[in-house]
Interface confidence: low
């Protein structure tokens, strides 16, 4: 529609009591030049008056100046351009809709953008990948709705409530399209990290703790096996008894099926956590290993050398 | 300090064709309208055209459209003003200017001006 | 286009004189809201203009306290109250509110 004002802006922005505001803004007027900018909260339209009514956050003088009163609110933007705005510090009660009434030499308008201010720092947002598999390298990604340059903020990943070792990339945006912090890390998880607690944890400048969120981690591995024989020491004589019991210590998902492998090949008829060999010949000596398989994959236990010596 | 320093010009055929360079510094380029004025010896001020750096956004003096182009190079700090089929009346000191207010139209910084000469 | 001519073209004055120079536009340079962008600059021999009034009547940062602007419509003025050595100058109006914007043709400020 060639009869409206362009504006390019977030169409909501977030922030918290004490914090601040910075609105990326950008437009372009009808009829080229600004004349005069009023920063309304919450305008409403007077049809008695033909103009809005509402608290007045910003007024540009017809001088330029800014009147000492109005220096929490900043437009940082200029004439033909930029509308940029600040709101320094922000509070709750700046919540709702904000009006930037732009008035050039022969056109008007009322851009709206609305703003969220909480009455404390809100969490931020932990985003995995859909599926975590162990030793494979994923990116967490920590998103907050906020950024602003009068206002420092930090995030800091713990894994079950102490720093993360791995160093993680902060990256902010302070643009028309959006408004964020964004903190990843590059982590190669272990089977034994499964369960366990992520924090995204938000800090001000100072490291102090302003909010949090945090995942369990779900971990995707293979089984991981535990074998044990009587003997314990896996040597007997011919004619003797031996038993093998596989332990699965962790599996996700769930095991699906197990199988026995002696020498690297595969047991007949042996699909059961118990593997017993009575009376042994010596031709059963061998290499034995448990093997479980789940979605992700076997997994096999270390392996038992058994020893049959001759009667 | 804002300073804005012209370069480029010189002797130059009619007919031929220069480019005048504006290197700014002192504030951020892209947010501010760079225009270009120009002044023949002994005459006065004449001008020719603006540029806003950061989109490159334009508008020119009717007689300058067609033979005179104006851009910015954001990355560079410098704004351009290319000069073709120019003629003898092209003689000129050629200055950029700033346009450094947000709501009042006014040239608050110029360059030192750099001399044009169009002859044969 | 807007033309804006300025009287006189020159004039000599010694220290101490009150100097007036009026720019008239061809058409009125006032818009709907109330502003009007009309500068004036004043320029040395071999230097670059220097901005001495904006928007009619305010006095640009460090610009002395003897030169103001007024007018309004198609008529304005540049008032030195008291001209002083270093005024000895050529001053020009400027409208900065239609393209293309346009300076007036000059008043040169000689010692008398």
């Known amino acids: 529609d060639s009869s409206k004002w362009v504006f390019e802006h977030p169409e909501t922005l977030y922030a918290w009591e004490g914090a601040c505001v910075w609105i990326p803004c950008t437009y372009r007027a009808l009829d080229g030049d600004l004349e005069s900018f009023i920063l309304f909260h919450n305008p409403e339209y007077n049809k008695n008056t033909s103009k809005f009514d509402g608290t007045r956050l910003y007024e540009s003088t017809k001088d330029g100046k800014v009147p000492s009163e109005q220096k929490r609110v900043q437009f940082l933007g200029d004439k033909n351009k930029n509308c940029t705005l600040s709101i320094h510090p922000v509070h709750l009660n700046d919540s709702g809709q904000l009006g930037l009434r732009m008035e050039s030499k022969t056109e008007k308008w009322m851009e709206r953008i609305h703003l969220n201010v909480s009455e404390r720092p809100f969490p931020p947002h932990i985003q995995l990948p859909p599926e975590i598999q162990e030793s494979q390298e994923v990116t967490l990604t920590c998103l907050l709705n906020f950024s602003c340059y009068g206002y420092p903020i930090q995030l800091q990943w713990l894994l079950e409530g102490v720093p993360m070792r791995q160093a993680a990339v902060t990256s902010t945006s302070l643009t028309i399209k959006s408004v964020f912090t964004r903190s990843e890390l590059k982590f190669s998880p272990q089977w034994s990290h499964h369960g366990k607690i992520v924090t995204c944890q938000l800090q001000d400048a100072d490291g102090k703790f302003l909010s949090n969120d945090t995942v369990q981690l779900n971990v995707k591995h293979t089984p991981k096996l535990e074998i044990k024989v009587t003997p314990s020491d896996a040597i007997v004589r011919e004619g003797d008894s031996v038993t093998m019991t596989c332990e699965v210590s962790s599996s996700n998902p769930e095991y699906t099926t197990v199988s026995w492998l002696k020498d690297g090949t595969s047991l007949k008829k042996q699909n059961t956590f118990t593997l017993n060999l009575r009376e042994v010949t010596k031709d059963q000596s061998g290499k034995y290993c448990c093997q479980v398989s789940n979605d992700v994959g076997p997994g096999r236990s270390e392996e038992v050398f058994l020893q049959v010596q001759y009667a | 300090e804002v300073q804005l320093v012209e370069s480029g010009g010189g002797l130059v055929q009619p007919g031929g064709s220069l480019r005048l360079s504006c290197a700014a510094s002192?504030?951020?380029?892209?947010?501010?309208?760079m225009n270009w004025v120009r002044q023949a010896p002994g005459k006065g001020l004449e001008w020719v055209g603006r540029?806003?750096?950061?989109?490159?956004?334009?508008n020119y003096s009717g007689k300058f459209k067609g033979r005179f182009t104006i851009s910015a190079d954001t990355s560079k700090n410098t704004a351009y003003l290319q000069m073709n089929s120019l003629r003898a009346e092209d003689t000129a000191v050629y200055y950029c200017?700033?346009?450094?207010?947000?709501?009042?139209?006014?040239?608050?910084?110029w360059g030192q001006g750099t001399l044009v000469t169009v002859s044969s | 286009d807007i033309q804006m001519t300025q009287s006189p073209s020159s004039l000599s004055a010694s220290v101490g004189d009150r100097v007036t120079i009026t720019c008239r536009s061809s058409?009125?340079?006032?818009?709907?809201?109330?502003?009007?962008?009309l500068e004036w600059y004043q320029q040395k021999p071999g230097k670059a203009p220097k901005l001495l009034i904006y928007k009619v009547s305010n006095r640009f940062s460090g610009v002395p306290s003897r030169f103001s602007g007024s007018g309004s419509g198609t008529d304005f003025t540049l008032t030195i109250s008291s001209l002083q050595p270093e005024d000895f100058a050529t001053y020009y109006c400027f409208q900065g509110s239609q393209f293309p914007y346009t300076f007036g043709q000059g008043t040169k400020v000689e010692i008398k």
């Open positions: 058409q009125s340079i006032v818009h709907s809201q109330g502003n009007t962008f």
């Open positions: 002192g504030y951020e380029f892209s947010r501010s309208w």
């Open positions: 200017a700033r346009d450094g207010s947000s709501w009042d139209w006014y040239f608050d910084v």
């Open positions: 540029i806003y750096p950061g989109d490159g956004d334009t």
